[in-house]
Amino acid sequence: AGVFELQIHSFGPGPGPGAPRSPCSARGPCRLFFRVCLKPGLSEEAAESPCALGAALSARGPVYTEQPEAPAPDLPLPNGLLQVPFRDAWPGTFSLIIETWREELGDQIGGPAWSLLARVTRRRRLAAGGPWARDIQRAGAWELRFSYRARCELLAVGTACTRLCRPRSAPSRCGPGLRPCAPLEDECEAPPVCRAGCSLEHGFCEQPGECRCLEGWTGPLCTVPASTSSCLGLRGPSSATTGCLVPGPGPCDGNPCANGGSCSETPGSFECTCPRGFYGLRCEVSGVTCADGPCFNGGLCVGGADPDSAYICHCPPGFQGSNCEKRVDRCSLQPCRNGGLCLDLGHALRCRCRAGFAGPRCEHNLDDCAGRACANGGTCVEGGGAHRCSCALGFGGRDCRERADPCAARPCAHGGRCYAHFSGLVCACAPGYMGSRCEFPVHPDGVSALPAAPPGLRPGDPQRYL
């Protein structure tokens, strides 16, 4: 027993001119998935012959939408390994078929449409338990890079997974029907392969396909307690016990149901009951339908009556992915404005706003002058958490609505006389002073304290600066 594992590293346009830009048709976005099929031996087999060693289907990859003018990328791939379990010995030589399928997500009637994009076939020799084998294959204009290996499971060892290994914690004596292997005392070598299903505890065999029972047990697979200590049809004593020959094989002998399917006999035949995720009369192919519950996190499954009808998961808010398996990082969209801190609480988003800002997305500026116009030509100045008006001369108050006497504050120095004017105020300076507020004295020797007198003015002239 063991598992064949396939890891797809990349799938994309091959090198050279004429390589396709996109796997999708003009009808819109698509996503990729892969099917692996294993057939025994190295012979050329018809493409549609059964995958006798098993088959597996990957999950759907992320949705791909072609970006115009962008360089053709390696395409987004499904996560994880493709695994094909095998029950019997690993054959060593096999045919590996990898199909790349496209699922178009445009507005097809009846749901997404499938088409085969590329198919590679490799005939290979491979020992179980070895390292990953890497390969690059071309299929038309496409290039596929992948690795694969076969590994043993369930205490099986060896290049064909036919030797049984006793765990170190087990008793030092090998179990019934197992001989110690030399030179490793921690391993036990399998005898001839008994009939499939033959009880490990109560049966053994000396010839392939046999199932002989230990004393006290009977039945074709030695699973039935015997009412007497002897059996009919004795073949003779064995080294360990008295054995019974089994009757002719029944329809379920050898367990024709793959992938853990359970077999039940019907008149002259058998039927398999497949575990979740497997389909076909013999459970030989993996697949997913709505009945398999493929949508996580409360996603709603639509379509998918059988694996030939693609299912679609409609995800609840906060989740995405073909199976609603990914939590949306809603904060990555930076919904909080004006430097607000985003908090994804699962059921909702919260924005923690900086001082001076408010609103669900911090969109309101508390200093915002909008809607708070300053009257009478005043200008609004933001800052300090509240708006402020800089009023035109002659006006005052919070919103510049109050009339103000510009001369009330006595702005003209040195006894200058103040006159209110439509655009402000005018100071008429007393003799010996100049400036808009009569702030500069004029010296008797005719030299102003200013660095230079404004052109066209003589010292001593009355100053009328507006």
């Epitope: 549609e48 199909e99 399928w101 019907t266 398999c272 497949c274 030989e284 059988d306 030939d308």
Partner: nanobody, 127 residues
Framework: QVRLVESGGGSVQVGGSLRLSCAAS?????????MGWFRQAPGKEREGVAA????????SYADSVKGRFTISQDNAKNTVYLQMNSLKPEDTAMYYC???????????????????WGQGTQVTVSS
């Protein structure tokens, strides 16, 4: 969604033969489908005629057609055929092709077990 397109129907005399074809769209499950032929005569229920498993080794027939009809497939063309010999007037009906990827069990002649259906092709047997 699997697309099924039937062809080959027509009018024939009693005792004659017809061969119906059902072309199916390809999918990863092309070789793991139950493909069935069903028929519906005017005013009657739809009934199963024959079925096969595209993975091989399993066919079944309605008692009324055993020995006269044969279901077969061409995997390379993704097509299933119904060869109808020794036709009788009671074989007159609209013939439908249907498909499903089963979950174990067997390929039965029960229309409730099939999810994908073609549009049908008319067969008329006249005396």
């Amino acid at each position: 969604q699997v697309r099924l397109v039937e062809s080959g129907g027509g009018s024939v005399q009693v005792g004659g033969s017809l061969r119906l074809s059902c072309a199916a769209s390809r999918s990863p499950y092309s070789s793991s489908r139950c493909m069935g032929w069903f028929r519906q005569a005017p005013g009657k229920e739809r009934e199963g005629v024959a079925a096969l498993y595209t993975g091989g080794g399993s066919t079944s027939y309605a008692d009324s057609v055993k020995g006269r009809f044969t279901i077969s497939q061409d995997n390379a063309k993704n097509t299933v055929y119904l060869q109808m010999n020794s036709l009788k007037p009671e074989d007159t009906a609209m013939y439908y092709c249907a498909a499903v990827v089963p979950r174990g069990g067997s390929c039965r002649l029960d229309e409730r077990g099939y999810y994908h259906w073609g549009q049908g092709t008319q067969v008329t047997v006249s005396s």
